[in-house]
């Protein structure tokens, strides 16, 4: 009798734990990637940023993959995506080529199955960074809730990459899964 | 037979409910703190803001602690942290000491065990608030996903605190737990 | 014996699944609404934006309702709310009547039971958009964690609606439920 109960309870608890693990504790995917400033492209045109840290300082990743400058989704779901991009210039870095700047970020999703790239979120500002001030700074924050499928890739494009702030607290992006797709 | 089933089911359901409570229903920690403008420091240097409401209007807290101007983590986990900081100036408040301003926010984490403070997120902008306009306004938003341990403290530092907008919809910060640490 | 075990396990698993469904899998409410630019009001005063998409492109909704320009809460809970609002102007769109602009967003909550409307979050900036530049752009992002009751309504107000960027990646707002109310 008691042996039967124990065996059955173990079996039932096992399925319970398995279900609970799948439904909640199973390490919901997330990523927080911080800029790797050793390889920031120069220029003022829109470029895709491919160098990010995923395992040092505040950077971390779980149940997602970082490859070739893109954050790859491994698990279908609804995710909250966010990005914080800081631009800065000090006169000691040299004169700006133009005082009128477009400082922009674009968070894009690429689907490999149907080769296409779409902008999920954009933000930024046009700025007049005059020579009258020795230091200039500007930050952009964007965030939103999106359905992502396994294999889809998230990447970050910015204008004027040479002006990016290389600090890990300044220029980063990330995602975390909030819920399953029904 | 039926009694045996009921007893066992109660036992199994009990562990289920206990697990479910721990895993989801157990009041995941959160906080949304709004600025307490009665005690905003003056000056233009970077200062830590210590006066926040936690229990009036939109402000609320659960399974976290607010003490000495810091939001204290009570439960290990991955949290989404955010801050919205608004600065404003009207000519009726008097002339600005300088028209060139750095309006910045820094979200910092302090570990008591290993006494150290680190900036998790920063944002802001340099601004030229000329006397040609009678009113100036600027808001910063930052957000990100971070691993926090019990006992760690989150605080907010800003430049030019005397320019802060004191409304609860303007200047606030918060956190909510998204998932456990594996 | 084995039949008894199967019957009981089915019964226990059934209650488990029911609980799990209620506690986690029960389709947590969310919405991501993108601007419908076919009906943006003109003018420079603060207006409520009533035209949003909820079922095309990135726009989606589940267990919430969109009606009369408002996002209606169907399920009590704590929600993370966010908005991204982009303003832009190109000289081909007409000449600016003033270079001094207040570009603002207000995320408001309306309670029908106690007829009242309150601003949960605000953000924006005063801008000087001079005729010397052919293109101007500025984005605002706000986000925060709020207790919402069934029947409450979320809406978006902006200044200078005629300057809104009509792209779905530019001007949007949303919400997702994070946890139940204790």
């Amino acid at each position: 009798g008691s042996q039967h109960i124990r065996a059955e309870k173990a079996m039932v608890d096992g399925s319970w734990l398995d279900l609970a693990k799948r439904s909640k504790l199973e390490a919901q995917p997330f990523a927080h990637l911080t800029i790797n400033a050793t390889d920031i492209p120069s220029g003022s045109h829109k470029v895709s940023l491919s160098s990010w840290y995923h395992d040092r300082g505040w950077a971390k990743i779980s149940n997602m993959t970082f490859s070739n400058g893109k954050l790859i989704v491994n698990q279908d779901g609804f995710y909250y995506l966010y990005a914080n991009i800081c631009f800065r210039h000090h006169e000691t870095s040299g004169d700006l080529a133009t005082e009128y700047l477009q400082l922009m970020v674009y968070v894009t999703k690429t689907s490999i199955k149907i080769p296409s790239s779409h902008t999920l979120m954009k933000g930024g500002s046009t700025k007049y960074w005059s020579g009258n001030s020795e230091f200039h700074f500007y930050s952009i924050n964007v965030g939103g809730f999106f359905k992502l499928r396994s294999g889809e890739e998230i990447s970050i494009e910015v204008s004027n990459p040479s002006l990016l702030d290389p600090d890990q607290d300044a220029t980063y992006f990330g995602a975390f899964k909030v819920r399953d797709i029904d | 037979g039926s009694q045996h089933i009921r007893a066992e089911k109660a036992m199994v359901d009990g562990s289920w409910l206990d697990l479910a409570k721990r895993s989801k229903l157990e009041a995941q920690p959160f906080a949304h703190l709004t600025i307490n403008a009665t005690d905003i420091p003056s000056g233009s240097h970077k200062v830590s803001l210590s006066s926040w409401y936690h229990d009036r209007g939109w402000a609320k807290i659960s399974n976290m602690t607010f003490s000495n101007g810091k939001l204290i983590v009570n439960q290990d986990g991955f949290y989404y942290l955010y801050a919205n900081i608004c600065f404003r100036h009207h000519e009726t408040s008097g002339d600005l000491a300088t028209e060139y301003l750095q309006l910045m926010v820094y979200v910092t984490k302090t570990s008591i065990k290993i006494p150290s403070s680190h900036t998790l997120m920063k944002g802001g902008s340099t601004k030229y608030w000329s006397g040609n306009s009678e009113f100036h306004f600027y808001s910063i938003n930052v957000g990100g996903f971070f691993k926090l341990r019990s006992g760690e403290e989150i605080s907010i530092e800003v430049s030019n605190p005397s320019l802060l907008d004191p409304d609860q919809d303007a200047t606030y910060f918060g956190a909510f737990k998204v998932r456990d640490i594996d | 014996g084995s039949q008894h075990i199967r019957a009981e396990k089915a019964m226990v698993d059934g209650s488990w699944l029911d609980l799990a469904k209620r506690s986690k899998l029960e389709a947590q409410p969310f919405a991501h609404l993108t601007i419908n630019a076919t009906d943006i009001p003109s003018g420079s005063h603060k207006v409520s934006l009533s035209s949003w998409y909820h079922d095309r492109g990135w726009a989606k909704i589940s267990n919430m309702t969109f009606s009369n320009g408002k996002l209606i809460v169907n399920q009590d809970g704590f929600y993370y709310l966010y908005a991204n609002i982009c303003f832009r102007h190109h000289e081909t769109s007409g000449d600016l009547a003033t270079e001094y602009l207040q570009l603002m967003v207000y995320v408001t909550k309306t309670s029908i039971k106690i007829p009242s409307s309150h601003t949960l979050m605000k953000g924006g900036s005063t801008k000087y958009w001079s005729g010397n530049s052919e293109f101007h752009f500025y984005s605002i992002n706000v986000g925060g964690f709020f207790k919402l009751r069934s029947g409450e309504e979320i809406s978006i107000e902006v200044s200078n609606p005629s300057l809104l960027d009509p792209d779905q990646d530019a001007t949007y707002f949303g919400a997702f439920k994070v946890r139940d109310i204790d």
Epitope: - | - | S42, G43, G94, L96, A97, N132
Partner: antibody
Framework: EVQLLESGGGLVQPGGSLRLSCAAS????????MSWVRQAPGKGLEWVSG????????YYADSVKGRFTISRDNSKNTLYLQMNSLRAEDTAVYYC???????????????WGQGTLVTVSS | EIVLTQSPGTLSLSPGERATLSCRAS???????LAWYQQKPGQAPRLLIY???SRATGIPDRFSGSGSGTDFTLTISRLEPEDFAVFYC?????????FGQGTKVEIK
């Protein structure tokens, strides 16, 4: 009551210059964008130039760009149009008109002054 | 620039009749950004309608505007003797602001 009164028109030779003025009253002048619109004899209306309330930004039709300059003196509630290198095709009645101030983009014109005639002829 | 073409060039009607004036744009006008003016001989233009369909202050309700995109209409439901004049449409959806060439409404 909003009133706009133009002056400074007259006969001028091709290549010559003229300065038109528009005296405004009945509203907070510095808060509104202003424009000049012209109408050649027996013809339709043509927008010429506009200026923001602060005077910080100015706009011109391609047909007058580089030759005409719009300005304002908010302390005197007066709008100006400096016209240089005048041509025969600039002959018209010149109206000053107020922007409504309810939109961030310059929009319709309301009200208009009574106009001043500029004749460019040798 | 956007070219506005008004039709007909001249409309001959009697008092009490309905007048329908057309304004067609060479490309779609962004938003409701179209206005109508009335000009009588020797006078400055007077604003009648703005934002396609909003009547200006003091304008009688017999004047109404409609349309969107490239096709806009000014309707005078019942002509009064003082209504006979030249009518101009004007767009302000893009720069530069432009006017139509005018429609003359004359007494038949």
């Amino acid at each position: 009551e909003v009133q706009l009164l133009e002056s400074g028109g007259g006969l001028v030779q091709p290549g010559g210059s003229l300065r038109l003025s528009c005296a405004a009253s009945g509203f907070t002048f510095s808060s509104y964008a202003m424009s000049w619109v012209r109408q050649a004899p027996g013809k339709g209306l043509e927008w010429v130039s506009g200026i923001t309330g602060s005077g910080g930004s100015t706009y011109y039709a391609d047909s007058v760009k580089g030759r005409f300059t719009i300005s304002r003196d908010n302390s005197k509630n007066t709008l100006y149009l400096q016209m240089n290198s005048l041509r025969a095709e600039d002959t018209a009645v010149y109206y000053c008109a107020k922007d409504p101030g309810t939109t961030v983009i310059m929009s319709w014109f309301d009200p208009w002054g009574q106009g001043t005639l500029v004749t460019v002829s040798s | 620039e956007i070219v506005l073409t008004q039709s007909p060039g001249t409309l001959s009607l009697s008092p009490g009749e309905r007048a329908t004036l057309s304004c067609r744009a060479s490309q779609a006008i962004r938003g409701p950004n179209l206005a109508w003016y009335q000009q009588k001989p020797g006078q400055a233009p007077r604003l009648l309608i703005y934002d396609t369909s909003s009547r200006a202050t003091g304008i009688p309700d017999r004047f109404s505007g409609s349309g969107s995109g490239t096709d806009f209409t000014l309707t005078i439901s019942r002509l009064e003797p003082e209504d006979f004049a030249v009518f101009y449409c004007q767009q302000y959806g893009s720069s530069p602001r432009t006017f139509g060439q005018g429609t003359k409404v004359e007494i038949k």
